[in-house]
């Protein structure tokens, strides 16, 4: 008799694919154009990242450090009307796109959560909770929460309301703390919170380091559902080179949990060089026209126009990784093993029931590596085959498709490696 | 109206470091940027950094390593700093506003300081 | 970066003659998405700071006087003025804002015959 599939896990819409980042609107769709109506005109191009959520804004009244001017039930009128924004949550929905509103109160600001006044604050978060999810918002946002007194407990009681009106709705909290015991403390008594932080922004970008941060992260949260991101609201860029860009692409769409990015790391978007560009929002590229101050400052290279007509752009790397993250089991709501493969690697599996295996080897350093995949660190459950197929690399060069021999596996310097291979019984 | 103003010692001592202060007028540095220019006697004109209007700081390559721009928005000044000063550094310097249309910087620069001159020299 | 090379370095002229200088940037500064060309001119009296006189390669800054003629391809740029005067007499600097860093030709020194 064939084995009994195992059940298949309760799977809410921000497990099956990538969050997407909008905080600027200005400078996602190019200065002079940054509104509702315009972003919009932008969802088809979300739509091709295969993202599943656009974490939008903030986009309220706020005026500066000011409590009594910042209203967080009406959009700022720069960015359009309550009938924009109605008319982009009904063609993001017919995208199968969900829409999260950032509303962190005082974003522009000195205090995310202005210094005083935490409960005047707090109420007016919860009467915005309410107003939005009836407008039919799919989730929210807070970001900052370092800022917020009793920040545990608010979340709690925010997650409550989210969660009352709606299994389906989400609550983000965004930190800028790294340290695994803040962290914890605060998803500690929120069960379904989905936290972003700067956890991993402190990898030192190795493949020890990264292992041993990820391996007790997922340890110390248990089974809980987690999010991965190197920040809670800045591009990659600002913590990596440009040669880990893709391999961070592929560890963080294949890591068991929700991947988050910010507008422009698909395309590996750097304010460092766009001079003059703020470096938490720079001006998206979409063509060599978007950064009209310093023309030479952008080549074809850096923008969508020229990396979507190049299948070895990073850009075509986030297309194809995002459509694996939302289609197969494994990396959908798979089991992850890491596993020792030797210094400045790492490497895990991703493995569901039946279901098609993932292996994914990343080399970390700026050597070429050997990898020695040591098999006995992994489970029964989990072994590997002496052969997997190359499903893709994040260097140009290797033939896809073809099998490799996991015991003479070689990496290229900073080389990510996303291997497949049947479940045997 | 808009007017810039370049202020700080004539004369310095080589390996010291030289602090300017350019004092503004007539417009925000929240929404402009301001270059430093120097001009050795005789000579022409070298760009030598900017800060720009969110406070990011660009330098010339060759002067990077010793070269500092910072700014105090409230009292409307921009500062430079370099240190590790030699002859070869005496000039007059100029501070200029960066070119801004409400949308984009351009990189031309509109107003000028009256410059001051410093001299390297033990 | 991109250099800026201007010619001749220093021209000795009469008052009422029509003069032209020029200056070429070792790569284009034509930008094709909105057709203009990122290159700035400045003068320079003795003993005064630069005044910027033209950008975008031909727009005169408002109070320059219309004998101030800019203009210019991708890498080779003029600067003419129709009838000089005794006041013009300065160092011409031409300036490229395409790439970044900013950079500067050396300079065309106009003198008295």
């Known amino acids: 008799r064939a084995p009994r599939c195992r059940e298949l896990p309760a799977q809410k819409w921000w497990h099956t694919g990538a969050l997407y980042r909008i905080g600027d609107l200005q400078a996602f769709q190019g200065h002079g154009a940054g509104n509702l109506a315009g972003l919009k005109g932008r969802l088809d191009y979300l739509s091709s990242l295969k993202v599943k959520g656009l974490v939008l804004g903030p986009i309220h009244k706020n005026q500066k450090d000011d409590v009594a001017q910042t209203d967080l039930l009406q959009i700022d009128p720069n960015f359009g009307s309550k009938e924009d924004f109605d008319s982009l949550l009904q063609s993001a929905k017919k995208k199968s796109i969900r829409v999260i509103l950032d509303l962190t109160p005082n974003y522009r600001g000195e205090n995310s959560w202005f210094s005083t006044q935490v409960d005047t604050v707090a109420t007016k978060v919860k009467d915005a909770l309410e107003f939005w999810l009836q407008a039919g918002v799919d989730g929210f946002q807070v970001r900052d929460i370092e800022n917020l007194k009793d920040a545990s407990s608010f979340l709690a009681e925010w997650q409550n309301i989210t969660k009352g009106f709606s299994e389906d709705r989400l609550l983000i909290a965004g930190t800028n703390s790294s340290d695994l015991q803040q962290i914890l403390s605060l998803l500690e008594s929120n069960k379904d919170l989905l936290l972003t932080s700067s956890y991993l922004s402190d990898s030192g970008s190795t493949g020890e380091h990264t292992k041993s941060l990820v391996t007790q992260y997922l340890n110390a949260t248990g089974n809980r559902w987690c999010s991965w991101s190197l920040s809670q609201a800045r591009l990659l860029t600002s913590f990596l080179p440009a040669q880990l860009l893709r391999l961070y692409q592929l560890m963080l769409f294949t890591l068991p949990g929700t991947p988050v990015f910010s507008y422009g790391d698909e395309i590996g978007l750097d304010a460092a060089a766009l001079p003059g560009q703020p470096m938490e929002a720079p001006v998206m590229l979409w063509d060599e026209s978007s950064f009209p101050d310093i023309p030479g400052a952008v080549s074809a290279n850096m923008t969508v126009k020229g990396q979507s007509e190049d299948p070895g752009s990073l850009l075509s790397l986030f297309r194809r990784l995002s459509d694996q993250r939302s289609k197969e089991r494994s990396l959908l709501h798979g089991d992850f093993h890491a596993f020792s493969a030797g210094p400045g690697l790492f490497s895990y599996i991703r493995h569901w029931d039946q279901n098609e295996r993932f292996l994914v080897v990343l080399n970390f350093g700026d050597v070429g590596l050997s990898a020695g995949l040591q098999a006995s660190d992994l489970p029964a459950s989990a072994s590997l085959p002496a052969k997997a197929d190359l499903l893709l690399s994040t260097q140009p060069g290797r033939e896809e498709g073809s099998p490799l021999e996991l015991e003479r596996l070689k990496l290229e310097p900073h080389e990510g490696l996303l291997l497949r291979f049947p479940y045997a019984a | 109206q808009v007017q810039l103003k370049e202020s700080g010692p004539g004369l310095v001592q080589p390996s010291q470091t030289l602090s300017l202060t350019c004092t503004v007028s007539?417009?925000?540095?929240?929404?402009?940027?301001v270059i430093w220019v120097r001009q050795p006697p005789g000579k022409g004109l070298e760009w030598m950094g900017i800060?720009?209007?969110?406070?990011?700081?660009n330098y010339n390559s060759a002067l990077k390593s010793r070269l500092s721009i910072s700014r105090d928005t409230s009292k409307s000044q921009v500062y430079l700093k370099m240190n590790s000063l030699q002859t070869e550094d005496t000039a007059t310097y100029y501070c200029?506003?960066?070119?801004?249309?409400?949308?984009?910087?351009?990189?031309?620069?509109?107003?000028w300081g009256q410059g001051v001159m410093v001299t390297v020299s033990s | 970066d991109t250099v800026m090379t201007q010619t001749p370095s220093s021209q000795a002229v009469s008052a009422g003659e029509k003069v032209t200088m020029s200056c070429k940037s070792s790569?284009?500064?034509?930008?094709?998405?909105?057709?203009?060309?990122?290159l700035a001119w400045y003068q320079q009296k003795p003993g005064q700071s630069p005044k910027l006189l033209i950008y975008?390669?031909?727009t005169r800054e408002s109070g320059v006087p219309d004998r101030f003629i800019g203009s210019g391809s991708g890498t080779d740029f003029t600067l003419t003025i129709s009838s000089v005067q005794a006041e013009d007499l300065a160092v011409y600097y031409c300036?490229?804002?395409?790439?970044?860093?900013?950079?500067f030709g050396a300079g065309t020194k106009l003198e008295l015959k």
């Open positions: 200029a506003r960066h070119y801004y249309d409400g949308t984009h910087y351009y990189g031309y620069f509109d107003y």
């Open positions: 007539g417009f925000s540095l929240s929404s402009y940027g």
């Open positions: 800060i720009w209007a969110n406070g990011n700081t």
């Open positions: 790569q284009s500064l034509l930008y094709s998405e909105n057709k203009k060309k990122y």
């Open positions: 975008w390669a031909s």
């Open positions: 300036q490229q804002y395409y790439n970044f860093p900013y950079t």
